[in-house]
């Protein structure tokens, strides 16, 4: 059965958009008039998980790319990525773990919580144009929060 | 050997609430989530929700302003509480195991207690 | 919430007939579909997951196949100890739903 998805756009609660950087980043800045089409148009596809009523298992593809947001360990510490994949298995419904995130809404804002490393989190720097990463603390000087806003196929 | 065994008072006075706990052995409920399920005498299964090894809990619909799922993982029990009891809610409760199996078939139960008949009356 | 047409609800066969229930989903669920047989006083016990494996220890008489949204649930030579009520349940999506039963009883 093909995967429900819908495209979007995602900006942090400082209104920064997501832009790549280089082939297998992505990079957090503010953006403005015509400089919004440099930013990344997610598909989002809604995929099984520990599916709870606060949190629904979600994978974040770039349209039209066979990437995804992935988590995986790098020197034993938890790593956001972006991970090519074959364009004729994916999205699929089962997707494996480590591209699997928990999409909480509190107060009209959005985390991303990886399925593989619970209370780790989508996140960006408080500067400008540094790399979109996996963070382990919430409320700090990262920021996990996001808006979504959505793009017409 | 994978086993889950319900427990709790066998009848509960209509607008209390229900309690019943699962016991389990064999694994870990840190590992696999565990599932309610109910079976009013005579009818069909209903799903009512799960808790996950991870703690999150998923409650069905037409239950979840009433319902209640926790864990206590030390002493590997599972706990159900549904509040404002009717007669509607007359049934034979089960747990059951999930399967968790990502990718391949993580939301099925593979084993389930005996059950236990809670009957809703004053 | 995935809605589960289970058919036929009774069932009347003998010992040796073949016997086929079927279980339609209102949405496409891929392989996501799992068969229960349940005896009187006891716990549903799973005899196929995955739509057609067959769980270990689980008698070779017993089939399932089907895919998407028309599954088929097969005893292929009935034995006494078969008389009881099967139920489907789709495990591809939350909540989780069951099919209404089939009572498989001696004529």
């Known amino acids: 059965a093909p995967v429900r998805s819908l495209n979007c756009t995602l900006r942090d609660s400082q209104q920064k958009s997501l832009v790549m950087s280089g082939p297998y980043e992505l990079k957090a800045l503010h953006l403005q008039g015509q400089d919004m089409e440099q930013q990344v148009v997610f598909s989002m596809s809604f995929v099984q998980g520990e599916e709870s009523n606060d949190k629904i298992p979600v994978a974040l593809g770039l349209k039209e790319k066979n990437l995804y947001l992935s988590c995986v360990l790098k020197d034993d510490k938890p790593t956001l990525q972006l991970e090519s994949v074959d364009p004729k298995n994916y999205p699929k419904k089962k997707m494996e773990k480590r591209f699997v995130f928990n999409k909480i809404e509190i107060n009209n804002k959005l985390e991303f919580e990886s399925a593989q490393f619970p209370n780790w989190y989508i996140s960006t720097s408080q500067a400008e144009n540094m790399p979109v990463f996996l963070g382990g603390t919430k409320g700090g000087q990262d920021i996990t929060d996001f808006t979504m806003q959505f793009v017409s196929s | 050997e994978v086993q889950l065994q319900e427990s709790g008072p066998g009848l509960v006075k209509p607008s209390e609430t229900l309690s019943l706990t699962c016991t389990v052995s064999?694994?870990?409920?840190?590992?696999?989530?565990v599932s309610w399920i109910r079976q009013p005498p005579g009818k069909g299964l209903e799903w009512i929700g799960l808790?996950?090894?991870?703690?999150?809990?998923y409650y069905n619909s037409p239950l979840k302003s009433r319902l209640t799922i926790s864990k206590d993982t030390s002493k590997s029990q599972v706990s159900l509480k549904l509040s404002s009891v009717t007669a509607a809610d007359t049934a034979v409760y089960y747990c059951?195991?999930?399967?968790?199996?990502?990718?391949?078939?993580?939301?099925?139960?593979?084993?389930w207690g005996q059950g236990t008949l809670v009957t809703v009356s004053s | 919430d995935i809605q589960m047409t289970q058919s036929p609800s009774s069932l009347s066969a003998s010992v040796g007939d073949r016997v086929t229930i079927t279980c339609q989903t209102s949405?496409?669920?891929?392989?996501?579909m799992n068969w229960y047989q349940q005896k009187p006083g006891k716990a549903p016990k799973l005899l196929i997951s995955?739509?057609?494996t067959l769980r270990p220890g689980v008698p070779s008489r017993f089939s399932g196949s089907g895919s998407g949204t028309d599954f088929t649930f097969t005893i292929s030579s009935l034995q006494p100890e078969d008389f009881a009520t099967y139920y489907c349940?789709?495990?591809?999506?939350?909540?989780?739903?069951f099919g209404q039963g089939t009572k498989l009883e001696i004529k």
């Open positions: 808790i996950w090894g991870g703690g999150d809990t």
């Open positions: 064999g694994f870990s409920l840190m590992d696999y989530g």
């Open positions: 995955l739509a057609s």
């Open positions: 349940l789709q495990s591809s999506w939350l909540p989780l739903t």
């Open positions: 059951a195991k999930q399967r968790n199996l990502w990718g391949y078939d993580l939301y099925g139960m593979d084993y």
């Open positions: 949405t496409d669920i891929d392989d996501d």
